[in-house]
C-alpha cells in the first residue's frame, strides 16, 4: 500500500514539476526591468528564451521574437537546450511511470518489469529536474554578472551633460517558477526510485529455500528474515520450493522492508 | 467615437481647492490611460499627472504635493483635484487618452480655470 | 527631472518651404528593449487643443500628411515639414514619453513670412 502511494504521489509530483517545467521554458518573464535605483520609466522590459517584450504604461504591450539562432549568446542557447533536455526527458518519463504505476493493469506485466520501468522514469525525473534547475541557474548567473557590470556602467563614464538610462534586469517570475518545479520533478524522481525498490519482487520473502543437511532433508521457511541485499534475490544456485499456490495480491501484500521508508 | 470632456469651476480664489472632472466616451478607463496637462494663456503645455489603466499614478514633481487624480470607471470619469491654488494656477486643463508609445491621441477641448480672488 | 529644450523658439516661413526643427533632451529616450526612442511631436493650432503627429519619434498618426517626417534618437531629435502648407501654420511641441514626468518641450511657433 505504501509503495503504491509512494508512486502515485512521485508521479503527480514529477507531472505538476514537469508541468512548471514547461510553464517557466514558454514564460517571457525570464528577466525583468529592475526598477530599483532607476529613474521611473513608462516603459517596462522584460525578456524570456524566445522573445523580448516592452510593456507601456498606457497598456501598450509589444514582444519580438530572437529571430537569429547564430547571433544569440551562447549562454542563452545553453538554457534553452537544458530546458528542452528537460522538458523531453521529463514527458518521457511521464509516459514510462504512466505504464509503471502499480495502480495500473497492463495484459500480465511482471512486477519486476513495472519496478524497472518505475526506476528508469525515476532517474529520468531525477535528470529532468536538474536539467532544468542547472538551465535556470545558468541564466540567473548570467543576469547577476550583467547586473553588476551595467552597475558599474551607471556610475563611470557620466562626465557629460547627457544621461543615458542603463536598463539593469533581475530575476523574473520564470526563474522562480523554474526553481520550484525543477525541485519537485526531482522529489517526484526520487519517489520513484524509492517506490521501485519496494515494488521488486524479494523472492525469499514468500519462497521456501531447501537447505541440506547430511541425512537429513528439512526444509526451513523463514518467517520476516530475509538474506538478500539487492533489489531482487540472487537465487543462482538455490533450490527453490513454492511455499505454496497464493494470489499475485497475497504475494504482494507481504511487509517489506521497503515499505516503510 | 472617442471623446473627452472636461468641467470646473471656471474661478476659484486663491488657497482654495480645485476639482475637475474629465469624462470620457468611446472607451473603457479600465484599458486607457488618461493625462492631464494645462497650458497657461499665452505659453507652453505642462504635463500635470496621469492614471493609468489599472489605477495607478504618477504626477509632475514640483506639483505632487498638491495634486491627486482619481476615476470612477462605471462613470467613465476622471478626476483632477489640486490643492492650495494660487494666480499661476490659472491655466487651460486639457484632459488627453494615452495611446501607443504613451503618446496622447485624442484630447479634450479644455477647460480654463482662473484663480483670481 | 529631465528637461526638453526646443529650438528655435520661432520659424518665419513660405509656404513651399521645407522647414526642420529640433528639439533636445537633457536624458536619452532610447529604451534598449524594443530599440524604440519616446518621443512625441504635436501640432497645436489657435484655440485648439493639441494634436498628435508623431510617436515613437518617427511613427506618424494616421491621417497625417507624410510631409511631416520625424527622426533621431537618443537624445537629439527633428521634426521636418517637407512643404509648408498654410495650415500647418501652428506650434509644434515635443514630448518625453519615456521618463517621469513626461515633459514637454518649449514649443516652437511656424509663422508665415
Known amino acids: 500500500m505504501a509503495v503504491t502511494a509512494c508512486q502515485g504521489l512521485g508521479f503527480v509530483v514529477s507531472l505538476i514539476g514537469i508541468a512548471g517545467i514547461i510553464a517557466a521554458t514558454c514564460m517571457d518573464q525570464w528577466s525583468t526591468q529592475d526598477l530599483y535605483n532607476n529613474p521611473v520609466t513608462a516603459v517596462f522590459n522584460y525578456q524570456g528564451l524566445w522573445r523580448s517584450c516592452v510593456r507601456e504604461s498606457s497598456g501598450f504591450t509589444e514582444c519580438r521574437g530572437y529571430f537569429t539562432l547564430l547571433g544569440l549568446p551562447a549562454m542563452l542557447q545553453a538554457v534553452r537546450a537544458l530546458m528542452i533536455v528537460g522538458i523531453v526527458l521529463g514527458a518521457i518519463g511521464l509516459l514510462v511511470s504512466i505504464f509503471a504505476l502499480k495502480c495500473i493493469r497492463i495484459g500480465s506485466m511482471e512486477d519486476s518489469a513495472k519496478a524497472n520501468m518505475t526506476l528508469t522514469s525515476g532517474i529520468m525525473f531525477i535528470v529532468s529536474g536538474l536539467c532544468a534547475i542547472a538551465g535556470v541557474s545558468v541564466f540567473a548567473n548570467m543576469l547577476v554578472t550583467n547586473f553588476w557590470m551595467s552597475t558599474a556602467n551607471m556610475y563611470t563614464g557620466m562626465g557629460g551633460m547627457v544621461q543615458t538610462v542603463q536598463t539593469r534586469y533581475t530575476f523574473g517570475a520564470a526563474l522562480f517558477v523554474g526553481w520550484v518545479a525543477g525541485g519537485l520533478t526531482l522529489i517526484g524522481g526520487v519517489m520513484m526510485c524509492i517506490a521501485c525498490r519496494g515494488l521488486a519482487p524479494e523472492e525469499t520473502n514468500y519462497k521456501a529455500v531447501s537447505y541440506h543437511a547430511s541425512g537429513h532433508s528439512v526444509a526451513y521457511k523463514p518467517g520476516g528474515f530475509k538474506a538478500s541485499t539487492g533489489f531482487g534475490s540472487n537465487t543462482k544456485n538455490k533450490k527453490i520450493y513454492d511455499g505454496g499456490a497464493r494470489t499475485e495480491d497475497e504475494v504482494q501484500s507481504y511487509p517489506s522492508k521497503h515499505d516503510y521508508v | 467615437q472617442v471623446q473627452l470632456k472636461e468641467s470646473g469651476p471656471g474661478l476659484v480664489a486663491p488657497s482654495q481647492s480645485l476639482s475637475i472632472t474629465c469624462t470620457v466616451t468611446?472607451?473603457?478607463?479600465?484599458?486607457?490611460?488618461v493625462h492631464w496637462v494645462r497650458q497657461p494663456p499665452g505659453k507652453g503645455l505642462e504635463w500635470l499627472g496621469v492614471?493609468?489603466?489599472?489605477?495607478?499614478?504618477n504626477y509632475d514633481s514640483a506639483l505632487m504635493s498638491r495634486l491627486s487624480i482619481s476615476k470612477d470607471r462605471s462613470k467613465s470619469q476622471v478626476f483632477l483635484k489640486m490643492t492650495s491654488l494660487q494666480t499661476d494656477d490659472t491655466a487651460m486643463y486639457y484632459c488627453?487618452?494615452?495611446?501607443?508609445?504613451?503618446?496622447?491621441?485624442?484630447w479634450g477641448q479644455g477647460t480654463t480655470l482662473t484663480v483670481s480672488s | 527631472d529631465i528637461v526638453m529644450t526646443q529650438s528655435p523658439s520661432s520659424l518665419t516661413v513660405t509656404t513651399g518651404e521645407k522647414v526642420t526643427m529640433s528639439c533636445k533632451s537633457s536624458?536619452?529616450?532610447?529604451?534598449?528593449?524594443?530599440?524604440?526612442?519616446?518621443l512625441t511631436w504635436y501640432q497645436q493650432k489657435p484655440g485648439q487643443p493639441p494634436k498628435l503627429l508623431i510617436y515613437?519619434?518617427?511613427t506618424r498618426e494616421s491621417g497625417v500628411p507624410d510631409r511631416f517626417t520625424g527622426s533621431g534618437s537618443g537624445t537629439y531629435f527633428t521634426l521636418t515639414i517637407s512643404s509648408v502648407q498654410a495650415e500647418d501654420l501652428a506650434v509644434y511641441y515635443c514630448?518625453?514619453?519615456?521618463?517621469?514626468?513626461?515633459?514637454f518641450g518649449t514649443g516652437t511657433k511656424l509663422e508665415l513670412k
Open positions: 514630448q518625453n514619453n519615456y521618463i517621469y514626468p513626461l515633459a
Open positions: 515613437w519619434a518617427s
Open positions: 468611446g472607451f473603457s478607463l479600465s484599458s486607457y490611460g
Open positions: 488627453a487618452r494615452s495611446l501607443y508609445g504613451n503618446s496622447f491621441d485624442h
Open positions: 492614471i493609468w489603466a489599472g489605477g495607478s499614478t
Open positions: 536624458q536619452s529616450l532610447f529604451n534598449s528593449g524594443n530599440q524604440k526612442n519616446y
